[in-house]
C-alpha cells in the first residue's frame, strides 16, 4: 500500500532536533551511513558500511546545513568484524577510531553498550537519514526516528527463513508501514538507554512480514572493549 | 523492456546551457535511479550524475557548480541541465538506469548501469 | 577523487586467446567495481558486476576477480565478437572509469 509523502525513516517522524546525541552521519562526500558514538574516540557502525576514508559528522540534524554544533572528525582507524560476511551479513558491525576526540556536551554524547540482550516487546529507537519512501527515494535533511519494538526471533525467523543467525534480531512491525531504509545503516537501535542493534537489512523497507533486521550488539560488547584496549 | 531515449539540441553555443532530456518507454521511471554519463569522441566515460524519482541527486564533484537533474513522472522524462558550457563539453550524452540492485541492506550506496541510451552527440560551438 | 588507472591501454590477441585486464584503485573499494564493454558507436554494456558477478545474459568467457585495490577482468578465449572497449567502473564512492583498453584482433 502507498504511503503519505510525510512518513519518515519510513512512517517516522522527526527527531526534535538534537534529541539523539550519540547519532552520526558517516559522510564520503556524501551521507552515506549512519553511526553510533559510544565513547569519546569510537563509533559503532555497521560493518558494509566499511569504506576506506569516512568523516564522521556528530552533532548534526539537518545535515545538508551548518546549524553551529556539528563536529566533523575523519576517521582514524575503521575495524571490520574478522568474521564479517557480505554474503550473509552475519557479524555486520564495524569500529571508528576518530581522528580526535569527540568534544561531549549536550547535543553530542555517547550511548552506552547493552548489559543483557534485548528482550521481545521492548520499545526501541530508530533514527537515521536514510530513505523515507517504502518505494522509490526520497532522502531527507533532517534526523528521523521511529518507536518500534523488538519481535520475537521465532517471528524474525519465520519472516526470513534460513537468514537470520544468533547476531541478528528483528525490530519492527509485521503489518509494514514503519520500518528503517536506505541510508540508515550504522545507525543506532537504543532501547532503554543502551545501544542494542546497529541497522543492518531488510527485504526492501516498509514491507509486510519483512521487518528489518539488525545487529545484536550485544554479542559484541567483549569484541568492542577489546578491539577499543587493543588500539587505544 | 525499458528503453531510454536521449532528446535536446545537437549545438549549443558557448557560456549557453545545454538541456537534454530522456524518456524512459516499456517500465515506469518510479522504480529506479537514473543517470547521465558523457564520452567526447575518442575519449572514455564520465559520469554526470544520478537522480531518484522523488528529485534526490547526487552530481559529480567536478561538474556539481554546473549540473541541475530534474525528473518529471508524469511524463517518465528525467532531464540534464549543464550550465556555462565550453568547447569541452561537446561529448555524446548517454542516459542511463541504476542497476538498483538495492540488495537488502540500508546503505546509500551506487551500483552502476544496466541499461543505456543509444546516447546523443552535442556539440558546442559559436 | 577515486582514480581507476586501467591497463593496458590497447591489446592485440588472437581468437582463443585468453585476454587479462587489469584495473587499480587509487583506495580501498572493497568490491564496488563493475567493467563494461563498448563497441565502437554504441552504448556501453555492462558485463560484470561487485568485480565478480556476470550480468544476466552475459557469456561465462568473462569473468573479474578482485578487491579492495586491485581488479582483473579476463575473456577466457577470445571472439571476434568480443573487439570492444573495456571500462572498469569504481562505484565505491560516487562514480569513477577507468581510461579503458581497447582488444582488437591480430
Known amino acids: 500500500a502507498p504511503f503519505d509523502d510525510d512518513d519518515k525513516i519510513v512512517g517516522g517522524y522527526n527527531c526534535e532536533e538534537n534529541s539523539v546525541p550519540y547519532q552520526v552521519s558517516l559522510n564520503s562526500g556524501y551521507h552515506f551511513c549512519g553511526g553510533s558514538l559510544i565513547n569519546e574516540q569510537w563509533v559503532v557502525s555497521a560493518g558494509h558500511c566499511y569504506k576506506s576514508r569516512i568523516q564522521v559528522r556528530l552533532g548534526e540534524h539537518n545535515i545538508e546545513v551548518l546549524e553551529g554544533n556539528e563536529q566533523f572528525i575523519n576517521a582514524a582507524k575503521i575495524i571490520r568484524h574478522p568474521q564479517y560476511d557480505r554474503k550473509t551479513l552475519n557479524n555486520d558491525i564495524m569500529l571508528i577510531k576518530l581522528s580526535s576526540r569527540a568534544v561531549i556536551n549536550a547535543r553530542v554524547s555517547t550511548i552506552s553498550l547493552p548489559t543483557a540482550p534485548p528482550a521481545t516487546g521492548t520499545k526501541c529507537l530508530i533514527s537515521g537519514w536514510g530513505n523515507t519512501a517504502s518505494s522509490g527515494a526520497d532522502y531527507p535533511d533532517e534526523l528521523q526516528c521511529l518507536d518500534a519494538p523488538v519481535l520475537s526471533q521465532a517471528k524474525c525467523e519465520a519472516s526470513y527463513p534460513g537468514k537470520i543467525t544468533s547476531n541478528m534480531f528483528c525490530v519492527g512491525f509485521l503489518e509494514g508501514g514503519k520500518d528503517s531504509c536506505q541510508g540508515d545503516s550504522g545507525g543506532p537501535v537504543v532501547c532503554n538507554g543502551q545501544l542494542q542493534g546497529v541497522v543492518s537489512w531488510g527485504d526492501g523497507c516498509a514491507q509486510k512480514n519483512k521487518p528489518g533486521v539488525y545487529t545484536k550488539v550485544y554479542n559484541y560488547v567483549k569484541w568492542i572493549k577489546n578491539t577499543i584496549a587493543a588500539n587505544s | 523492456q525499458v528503453q531510454l531515449q536521449e532528446s535536446g539540441p545537437g549545438l549549443v553555443k558557448p557560456s549557453e546551457t545545454l538541456s537534454l532530456t530522456c524518456t524512459v518507454s516499456g517500465g515506469s521511471i518510479s522504480s529506479h535511479y537514473w543517470h547521465w554519463i558523457r564520452q567526447p569522441a575518442g575519449k572514455g566515460l564520465e559520469w554526470i550524475g544520478r537522480i531518484a524519482t522523488s528529485g534526490s541527486t547526487y552530481y559529480n564533484p567536478s561538474l556539481k557548480s554546473r549540473v541541475t537533474m530534474s525528473v518529471d513522472t508524469s511524463k517518465n522524462q528525467f532531464s540534464l541541465k549543464l550550465s556555462s558550457v565550453t568547447a569541452a563539453d561537446t561529448a555524446v550524452y548517454y542516459c542511463?538506469?541504476?542497476?538498483?540492485?538495492?540488495?537488502?541492506?540500508?546503505?546509500?550506496?551506487?551500483?552502476?548501469?544496466?541499461?543505456w541510451g543509444q546516447g546523443t552527440t552535442v556539440t558546442v560551438s559559436s | 577523487d577515486i582514480q581507476m588507472t586501467q591497463s593496458p591501454s590497447s591489446l592485440s590477441a588472437s581468437v582463443g586467446d585468453r585476454v587479462t585486464i587489469t584495473c587499480q584503485a587509487s583506495?580501498?573499494?572493497?568490491?564496488?567495481l563493475n567493467w563494461y564493454q563498448q563497441k565502437p558507436g554504441k552504448a556501453p554494456k555492462l558485463l560484470i558486476y561487485d568485480a565478480s558477478n556476470l550480468e544476466t545474459g552475459v557469456p561465462s568467457r568473462f569473468s573479474g576477480s578482485g578487491s579492495g585495490t586491485d581488479f582483473t577482468f579476463t575473456i577466457s578465449s577470445l571472439q571476434p565478437e568480443d573487439i570492444a572497449t573495456y571500462y572498469c567502473?569504481?562505484?565505491?564512492?560516487?562514480?569513477?572509469f577507468g581510461g579503458g583498453t581497447k582488444v582488437e584482433i591480430k
Open positions: 567502473q569504481q562505484v565505491d564512492n560516487f562514480i569513477t
Open positions: 542511463a538506469r541504476d542497476l538498483t540492485n538495492y540488495g537488502i541492506t540500508k546503505s546509500i550506496r551506487f551500483y552502476g548501469m544496466d541499461v
Open positions: 583506495q580501498d573499494i572493497s568490491n564496488y
